[in-house]
């Protein structure tokens, strides 16, 4: 007896983090036996979209011509073959930026910091938010997700770095978000260039030591003042 149909592969082009108003295409790739593809959005009352396969039938395209809040969320896809529906794909989290006004990112005491010293990146929003995200450009996992304790809304989050090494240098941005949808982010802050001087270390960045990498066995997790990292919300953007 045949086992369950293999799960399809789900991905988004140009990526899964999309600015408001931009287009995105979601692809679901199954097998050549597929007769129909279905895209389901988490907690949607009905299938999100259904499409006939593109020749040679092993994938389907789900188009979003203009990204809005409606489309942000967690998706899975399935395909139907003559023997029934497949297993679900691994989830795809589609995040929309531009839902709220941009926060301000600054460095205290200064964006110019000596190796071995401390610096705190401060992300401030005009209106109270309960989630703040710090992005480092070109980091392997460029997102650190910090959520206020008890859902308390705050105007800012602090990202302390100590001791600073050369790998902390680089360009950072931050986002803010409301707890009711972690798939809706603000516009990005203006970039902040953190310059680390006086270091004798190898200046090449090590992704495993990146400030914005999810905490591993060697990493010291960043603890924002009055906030805690919330593992259920930490996401990696490739």
């Amino acid at each position: 007896q045949a086992g369950p149909l293999p799960k399809p592969t789900l991905w988004a082009e140009p990526g899964s983090v999309i600015s408001w108003g931009n287009s995105v295409t979601i692809w679901c790739q199954g097998t050549l036996e597929a007769r129909e593809y279905r895209l389901d959005k988490e907690e949607s009352p009905a299938p999100w979209d259904r499409q006939n396969p593109l020749e040679p039938k092993n994938k389907a395209r789900f188009s979003i011509p203009s990204m809005t809040e409606d489309y942000a969320g967690r998706y899975r896809c399935y395909y139907r073959s003559p023997v029934g529906w497949s297993q679900p794909s691994d989830p795809l989290e589609l995040v929309m930026t531009g839902a709220y006004s941009k926060p301000t990112l600054s460095a205290l005491p200064s964006p110019l910091v000596t190796s071995g010293k401390s610096v705190t990146l401060l992300c401030q929003s005009r209106s109270p938010m309960d989630t703040f995200l710090l992005i480092k450009e070109r980091a392997a996992h460029p997102l650190l997700h910090l959520r206020s304790e008890h859902g308390a809304q705050q105007h800012q989050a602090e990202f302390p770095m100590s001791p600073v090494t050369s790998v902390h240098g680089g360009t950072y941005r931050c986002f803010s978000s409301h707890g009711f949808s972690h798939y809706l982010l603000s516009h990005p802050s203006d970039p902040l260039e953190l310059i680390v001087s006086g270091s004798l270390e190898d200046p090449r960045p090590s992704p495993t030591r990146s400030v914005s990498t999810a905490a591993g066995p060697e990493d010291q997790p960043l603890m924002p003042t009055g906030s805690v990292p919330h593992s259920g919300l930490r996401r990696h953007w490739e």
Epitope: L39, K41, E43, S44, P45, A46, P47, W48, D49, R50, T68, E69, D70, Y71, G73, W85, F180, S181
Partner: antibody, heavy 122, light 109 residues
Framework: QVQLVESGGGVVQPGRSLRLSCAAS????????MHWVRQAPGKGLEWMAG????????YYIDSVKGRFTISRDNSKNTLYLQMNNLRAEDTAVYYC???????????????WGQGTLVTVSS | DAVVTQESALTTSPGETVTLTCRSS?????????ANWVQEKPDHLFTGLIG???NRAPGVPARFSGSLIGDKAALTITGAQTEDEAIYFC?????????FGGGTKLTVL
């Protein structure tokens, strides 16, 4: 044109069972989700249950979970509502309504039947 | 359990713009509630107007539009007609069930 015709209503004693049917025509029934919605005398609408196009997902309002079962037979273009352990407060006109093919295409509750009256009384 | 609240009655004049609203007891109505609007005409004739991803049902005039205004869902009729006199129900989705509002009786005088 799209038509939904409910049947199976009537007068029944508390604690007894009833099965409602909704015969669909004028569209490809197997492509659409379906709902049961009721309206008690002089009251507003109350959604009861919904089922996906292929029957894989079923949803119920808390007050009927375990007592009512929604099902469908796509080969017969028919939607069903099996109602067990009926109570006086289940007295209402029961409507079937069509759902969407998918969320990006169509409007839930776009077409409705004319309703069938269920009276639960001793 | 969530309660969905609508204006019990509204009156407008032909050609005027009228907005009906739909409030959730659980907080702000969001896109995840998939606000839906159903029209009831005399003799219990129900028709879905707007829902899904803000889709308008085929045959529904363009003067009907759905939106989120503040923390509520809204149905706006731009240039009401006498034939728009009806009861309008909104329905909101709560993760695994729908809840209808009590309905708004719209009179077009």
């Amino acid at each position: 044109q799209v038509q939904l015709v409910e049947s199976g209503g009537g007068v029944v004693q508390p604690g007894r069972s009833l099965r409602l049917s909704c015969a669909a025509s004028g569209f490809t029934f197997s492509n659409y989700g379906m709902h049961w919605v009721r309206q008690a005398p002089g009251k507003g609408l109350e959604w009861m249950a919904g089922i996906w196009f292929d029957g894989t997902n079923k949803y119920y309002i808390d007050s009927v979970k375990g007592r009512f079962t929604i099902s469908r037979d796509n080969s017969k273009n028919t939607l069903y509502l099996q109602m067990n352990n009926l109570r006086a407060e289940d007295t209402a006109v029961y409507y079937c309504a069509r759902d969407v093919i998918s969320m990006v295409r169509g409007v839930p509750f776009d077409y409705w039947g004319q309703g069938t009256l269920v009276t639960v009384s001793s | 359990d969530a309660v969905v609240t609508q204006e019990s009655a509204l009156t407008t004049s032909p050609g005027e713009t009228v907005t009906l609203t739909c409030r959730s007891s659980t907080g702000a109505v969001t896109t995840s509630n998939y606000a839906n609007w159903v029209q009831e005409k005399p003799d219990h004739l129900f028709t879905g107007l707007i829902g899904g991803i803000n889709n308008r049902a085929p045959g529904v005039p363009a003067r009907f539009s759905g939106s989120l205004i503040g923390d509520k869902a809204a149905l706006t009729i731009t240039g009401a007609q006498t034939e728009d006199e009806a009861i309008y129900f909104c329905a909101l989705w709560y993760s695994n069930h729908w809840v209808f509002g009590g309905g708004t009786k719209l009179t077009v005088l």
